[in-house]
Interface confidence: medium
């Protein structure tokens, strides 16, 4: 058992049936000795008495909020929480996989540019008793920190009969270089609690992998005298890191015509313009990836060719 | 300085083009070296990020653009500790924090030589000759030394001699190859600031 | 108060593209739910798309998946949200409307306080 903030403690399990359980001692907080009694929940059943309560945690009814009482009037409060652990392995019953970039990935993190500013975002199916808590470091050994704002929910969709919500957080370095040379990775750690059961979840990562660039700003097209051709000219996002000399971008462009199956023209430039056969019906799409160091590309930003 | 240039003049600042080079050399390195050695943790997740040239010379900090230089963040460890002219800077006018960040990139270039040159016979002695270092990425290394044209001495190739343990030396390789593509990474950052400077 | 401005309506024959842009300002921020839903003549205003606040994430009607793309510019603390149509069928004809939320992204009306005039898109040859 281990305290998750004041009064709230995690009960570690190992879930099987007929498993035996956890003994928990709970101590209420008074310089009272005698004439308590226990309560849990809502319930007015006693379920002992004294200072100190013994209980064998097993299942989530031996979960939830127990009180210590005197004479009618409440003591202290501590309420337990059940963290299922089933062949080893921690229950991920909360959030959702979203087996990108690869299996057993619940959390999601992208930066646009070097500033230490990350956002990292999580998908669930629970839609009510649930809060999640979200603490962040560099390196974990001799943590650097790294402040994390209130998790809130940032968008709610439907996916087939279900409803899917998708809960968002955005964290910075407290005193991040955008030049610096990363050794030790992020750590974002959340904390979720959906009724009486606790999970964690982790991810890992160096800023450099988890760059995703806004698309190119100010798209253009400037049609070249007696000529199919234009000039499509665009400017870094306002969001890159400066100055952009250092912080170079690479482009994609590409010609797309209205039909999916048509082929697509690609160019690649580490210029902000490129000439283009523009055809009919077709856009021109154009997107940014840092020049040097291959992570996400950005999506893309688009024009019609008319 | 919005507009990055794509091909440059060579004769303007020759140590962009070798930069890129350098670059691709150890990408393609590592690449290969993830794929030959899919057995070994080899993985940027895990492997243990070290940086063989810590506390030896201050690239990161010795070539900070000068927009940056108000990041106190940034400040944490400049050091000033040595000057010389190189000839990539052509007939530019040389400032002191130039010529120091070009020499500690030198400096950088000369460590790794000497590693990879180190690990390299230590490979070639492996009966499984499974990876061996690319001779490009030695040879771009040796290019970028001389465009730089720093005056050092030479330091002698190490050898040891001790039984090598394969495993333990195919592993450095993995450490060595992140930590240098990240290294070449801030290079070729450098040399593309200091062309459009 | 948020003002929401639409641009960028107007008549294309079908097959052709369309940008619609719709700029947010009144109050400075980017961490905004924003969307674009239309009304066809005849018919209630229904969902086409949004940008989730903060994660940006997106999400489309069945009906422009693939032929329609939302995107936003956070630039100096003001929020574009465009629209880029292509592909565009008869049956897109109608008055768009950009809304904005500093709540979450959902592809429900009501979550939304803030609604542009909207700009009418007429698909005709």
């Known amino acids: 058992i281990w305290e998750l903030k004041k009064d709230v403690y995690v009960v570690e399990l190992d879930w099987y049936p007929d498993a035996p359980g956890e003994m928990v001692v709970l101590t209420c907080d008074t310089p009272e000795e005698d004439g308590i009694t226990w309560t849990l929940d809502q319930s007015s059943e006693v379920l002992g008495s004294g200072k100190t309560l013994t209980i064998q945690v097993k299942e989530f009814g031996d979960a939830g909020q127990y009180t210590c009482h005197k004479g009618g009037e409440v003591l202290s409060h501590s309420l337990l929480l059940l963290h299922k652990k089933e062949d080893g392995i921690w229950s991920t019953d909360i959030l959702k996989d979203q087996k990108e970039p690869k299996n057993k990935t619940f959390l999601r993190c992208e930066a646009k540019n070097y500033s230490g500013r990350f956002t990292c975002w999580w998908l669930t199916t629970i839609s009510t008793d649930l809060t999640f808590s979200v603490k962040s470091s560099r390196g974990s050994s001799d943590p650097q920190g790294v402040t994390c704002g209130a998790a809130t929910l940032s968008a709610e969709r439907v996916r087939g009969d279900n409803k899917e919500y998708e809960y968002s957080v955005e964290c910075q370095e407290d005193s991040a270089c955008p030049a610096a040379e990363e050794s030790l990775p992020i750590e974002v750690m959340v904390d979720a609690v959906h009724k009486l059961k606790y999970e964690n979840y982790t991810s890992s990562f160096f800023i450099r992998d988890i760059i995703k660039p806004d698309p190119p700003k100010n798209l253009q097209l400037k049609p070249l005298k007696n000529s199919r051709q234009v000039e499509v000219s665009w400017e870094y996002p306002d969001t890159w890191s400066t100055p952009h000399s250092y912080f170079s971008l690479t482009f994609c462009v590409q010609v797309q015509g209205k039909s999916k199956r048509e082929k697509k023209d690609r160019v690649f430039t580490d210029k902000t313009s490129a000439t283009v056969i523009c055809r009919k019906n077709a856009s021109i799409s154009v997107r940014a990836q840092d020049r040097y160091y291959s992570s996400s590309w950005s999506e893309w930003a688009s024009v019609p060719c008319s | 300085r919005n507009l990055p240039v794509a091909t440059p003049d060579p004769g303007m600042f020759p140590c962009l083009h070798h930069s890129q080079n350098l670059l691709r050399a150890v990408s393609n390195m590592l690449q290969k070296a993830r794929q030959t050695l899919e057995f070994y943790p080899c993985t940027s997740e895990e492997i243990d990020h070290e940086d063989i040239t810590k506390d030896k010379t201050s690239t990161v900090e010795a070539c900070l653009p000068l927009e940056l230089t108000k990041n106190e963040s940034c400040l944490n460890s400049r050091e000033t500790s040595f000057i010389t002219n190189g000839s990539c800077l052509a007939s530019r006018k040389t400032s002191f924090m130039m010529a120091l960040c070009l020499s500690s990139i030198y400096e950088d270039l000369k460590m790794y030589q000497v590693e990879f040159k180190t690990m390299n016979a230590k490979l070639l002695m492996d009966p499984k000759r499974q990876i061996f270092l690319d001779q490009n990425m030695l040879a771009v290394i040796d290019e970028l030394m001389q465009a730089l044209n720093f005056n050092s001495e030479t330091v002698p190739q190490k050898s040891s001699l001790e039984e090598p343990d394969f495993y333990k030396t195919k592993i450095k390789l993995c450490i060595l190859l992140h930590a240098f593509r990240i290294r070449a990474v801030t290079i070729d950052r450098v040399m593309s600031y200091l062309n459009a400077s | 108060q948020v003002q929401l401005v639409e641009s960028g309506g107007g008549l294309v024959q079908p097959g052709g593209s369309l940008r619609l842009s719709c700029a947010a300002s009144g109050r400075e921020f980017t961490s905004v739910s924003m969307a674009w839903f239309r009304q066809r003549p005849g018919k209630e205003r229904e969902f086409v798309a949004f940008?989730?606040?903060?994660?940006?994430?997106?999400?489309?009607a069945d009906f422009v998946k693939g032929r329609f793309t939302i995107w936003r510019d956070n630039a100096n603390a003001k929020v574009t949200v465009y629209l880029q149509m292509n592909n565009l069928k008869p049956e897109d004809t109608g008055v768009y409307y950009c809304?904005?939320?500093?709540?979450?992204?959902?592809?429900?009306?009501?979550?939304?306080?803030?609604w542009g005039q909207g700009t009418q898109v007429t698909v005709s040859s």
């Open positions: 809304a904005a939320s500093e709540g979450p992204a959902t592809i429900r009306q009501n979550t939304y306080p803030d």
């Open positions: 940008s989730a606040r903060i994660s940006e994430t997106t999400e489309y």
